[in-house]
């Protein structure tokens, strides 16, 4: 049996070498001479010759300093043979443990660690974590037990201890209030990692902490008073530019200005933000009226796109806006005037007066009236008074100029300001009907076939309006009833049916037809009838001599 005590060897041993470790023995040495040898890593395999054994005594020796961080344990096999070379023992595994010395200092995983924290962060806010490693034994010793400390902080303002580091974890957190990006945007910490829980070997690294922006500074007007002027009636006109400064990070929501007009209930003004320089551009949202108000004193507040992070006073500015008077066109009241008038209204008589009001109440101005559009040339106007009268007969049935019984004329009013301004009014003449149109037949030219003629429907048309229209009365005159008959086609008597009484010769005929409306206005119309050489429904006939009173006239 083997006698091998546990074997450990400290790393980094000083000489002289070789140095005895343990003496190994086999019980078989009582029976005769035993010779010892070793094999394995560190003996006969790389690194070869680190361990040797005295062949006759069994003393195991180390020949050079060991490095635990390179090889922490060596596995060897001991062999015992008799003088004739025969094995007297089975090979035995020998474990050599290299015990640790604190020969490695901690190493930070980075030379520079970068972190960030919001300005105004409260104590206890985590910022970042630094990490160091140590190659020494962290299981059986504290040679790799790292403790972290902060050695320095730059700047040391507003306090020299703005941050703390957890000695065990390396987590850096805020420990003092007062982080302010606008004053101190970055901090540089020199951090130390020391083994043996802070009492051993040490190394340093840098932690750079960026203080990020929050909206802790308000935009401030500079100056706080402004003057501007704007012509009346013009929308989207720039009045003035408002200037603000904001200490927060440029081109961020905490810097970008939002302008609010505090006393603009009518929504007459608007302030937009220039995205480049944060200026407020004050413009008119709608046209202003000099005659209503000549000056506005606006109070404008400025905030940011995002809310303030802390309680801040909102900056305000006062803007005095002078409205400039502009010569405005006269305004017809109403802008569209409706007047009812009979179509037989007497020529030269006054229909109505249509006048305009002068908006420029602060100017003494004279208004002159003219007719701008009068397509039928029916009207004339008094240039001073705006009185409108007829210069020709009106006609409701003039369908070229009258639509839906309405005649439209445009009137203009011109002041004597500088420059001259002109306003327009619309005059609608609603023409009431007079029974000035007798009924007429439609069509007036009719075709029949000689054989088996088909009766023809004739519509009765009256340009007037009820009650000056249907029911109509129809009557054949001048002997036409000898050859022709008529009868009403519908209860309103708005059409009749014409047909011959007997077979007629091919040729042209004239029929006198008297038509009378509901108010007894009548008119005799001559119908031109052609009888064709055909049967049933007629086509178009050759032209023949007309026949008076429905009788054929020989050629």
């Amino acid at each position: 049996d083997w006698v091998i005590p546990p074997i450990s060897c400290p790393e980094n041993e000083k000489g002289p070498f070789p140095k005895n470790l343990v003496q190994i023995k086999s019980n078989k040495d009582k029976e005769g001479k035993v010779f010892y040898s070793i094999t394995g890593q560190g003996a006969d395999t790389p690194p070869v010759g680190v361990f040797i054994i005295e062949r006759e005594t069994g003393w195991l020796k180390v020949t050079e300093p060991l490095d635990r961080e390179r090889i922490a344990t060596y596995t060897l096999f001991s062999h015992a043979v008799s003088s004739n070379g025969n094995a007297v023992e089975d090979p035995m595994e020998i474990l050599i443990t290299v015990t640790d010395q604190n020969d490695n200092k901690p190493e930070f995983t980075q030379e520079v660690f970068k972190g960030s924290v919001m300005e105004g962060a409260l104590p206890g806010t985590s910022v970042m974590e630094v990490t160091a490693t140590d190659a020494d034994d962290d299981v059986n010793t504290y040679n790799a037990a790292i403790a972290y400390t902060i050695l320095s902080q730059d700047p040391e303002l507003p306090d020299k201890n703005m941050f703390t580091i957890n000695r065990n974890t390396g987590v850096i957190s805020v420990v003092t209030t007062g982080l302010d990006r606008e004053s101190f945007p970055t901090y540089t910490l020199v951090v130390q990692a020391a083994d043996l829980q802070g009492e051993g070997l040490s190394t340093t690294a840098t932690a750079v902490i960026t203080v990020t922006d929050t909206n802790d500074n308000p935009p401030i007007f500079n100056p706080t008073t402004y003057k501007g002027q704007v012509p009346e009636n013009e929308a989207n006109v720039v009045i003035t530019t408002l200037k603000v400064t904001d200490a927060d990070a440029p081109n961020t929501p905490a810097w970008e200005a939002v302008y609010t007009i505090l006393n603009d209930d009518g929504g007459q003004f608007v302030v937009t933000t220039n995205p480049v320089n944060n200026d407020g551009i004050l413009k008119t949202a709608k046209g202003l009226d000099f005659e209503a108000k000549q000056q506005y004193i606006l109070h404008v507040a400025v905030t940011n796109v995002v809310p303030f992070e802390v309680s801040l006073t909102t900056s305000t500015a006062t803007v005095t806006v002078d409205v400039l008077d502009v010569n405005e066109a006269p305004i017809f009241v109403p802008p569209e005037k409706r007047v009812e008038v009979s179509e037989d209204f007497g020529v030269g008589q006054e229909i109505t007066s249509y006048t305009a009001q002068e908006p420029d109440t602060f100017m003494e101005q004279k208004i002159t009236y003219r007719i701008w559009r009068d397509t039928a040339n029916w009207l004339e106007i008094n240039p001073d008074t705006g009185a409108i009268s007829t210069r020709a007969e009106l006609d409701r049935e003039d369908f070229e100029h009258v639509k839906n019984s309405t005649y439209t004329a445009l009137i203009i009013a011109t002041d004597n300001g500088s420059p001259v301004a002109t306003g327009t009014g619309t005059l609608l003449l609603i023409l009431s009907d007079v029974n000035d149109n007798a009924p007429i037949p439609e069509p007036r030219t009719i075709f029949f076939c000689e054989r088996n003629p088909k009766p023809q429907v004739i519509n009765i048309i009256d340009a007037d309006l009820p009650p000056n229209t249907s029911p109509f009365t129809a009557e054949l005159t001048h002997g036409a009833s000898a050859n022709w008959t008529i009868q009403y086609n519908d209860p309103t008597q708005e059409s009749i049916i014409l047909k011959p009484k007997m077979a007629l010769e091919v040729g042209d005929y004239k029929i006198n037809l008297k038509l009378m409306d509901n108010q007894n206005k009548d008119q005799v119309t001559t119908l031109e009838v052609s009888v064709c050489d055909c049967e049933g429904a007629a086509g178009v006939c050759r032209k023949a001599q007309p026949v008076e009173a429905g009788l054929q006239i020989p050629a």
Epitope: E129, T131, A147, R167, N168, T169, V171, S173, Q197
Partner: antibody, heavy 120, light 112 residues
Framework: DVQLVESGGGLVQPGGSRKLSCAAS????????MHWVRQAPETGLEWVAY????????YYAATVKGRFTISRDNARNTLFLQMTSLRSEDTAMYYC?????????????WGQGTSVTVSS | DVLMTQTPLSLPVSLGDQASISCRSS???????????LEWYLRKPGQSPRLLIY???NRFSGVPDRFSGSGSGTDFTLKISRVEAEDLGVYYC?????????FGGGTKLEIK
Amino acid sequence: DVQLVESGGGLVQPGGSRKLSCAASGFTFSSYGMHWVRQAPETGLEWVAYITTRSSTIYYAATVKGRFTISRDNARNTLFLQMTSLRSEDTAMYYCTREPLTGYYAMDYWGQGTSVTVSS
Amino acid sequence: DVLMTQTPLSLPVSLGDQASISCRSSQSIVHSDGNTYLEWYLRKPGQSPRLLIYKVSNRFSGVPDRFSGSGSGTDFTLKISRVEAEDLGVYYCFQGSHAPWTFGGGTKLEIK
């Protein structure tokens, strides 16, 4: 609200093994060092083990070194204690505790504990 | 390892009395960073322990000002100026300066 909930306790035979878990919520688990502390019946509090945020440094009490292993899973917000070769003197209420961010003191929040009994 | 010894084991008091608990470490517990990580914890029956004092003399948030801590090097004291019923329980000192970290054996504060 910070919460630490231990589980995995129970009756174990001497020489046996057990794995305790501690589910953390209400804080950024990965930024905090964590401890296991125990209290045996009729005796005082005993600190058992500690682990840093990234498991880079681990400390054990001499009484458990080589038998207990502390570990953590930051993705699952969970702390573990693997106990092997258990002895009757390991019978105790086991608490999971949180080290504060600053490390100014050892433990600011404690769980309600999980009971481990080692007996045949 | 640092051994923490607490005295007395039991401290009978009347409500309103002052109480004083001593804790002695087997070696200095001043950390290499200059801080002394000596803490006091209270465990009430049926509850998890809670922190009272850290770094020798700093009261944890929410701890009444009748609790105070003092000491340096190896000798530390916890004082309760006027004991109230809610203060009863077992008090432990703890050192977090040198791993492995250690608790004291505990002092039971009870009514006479």
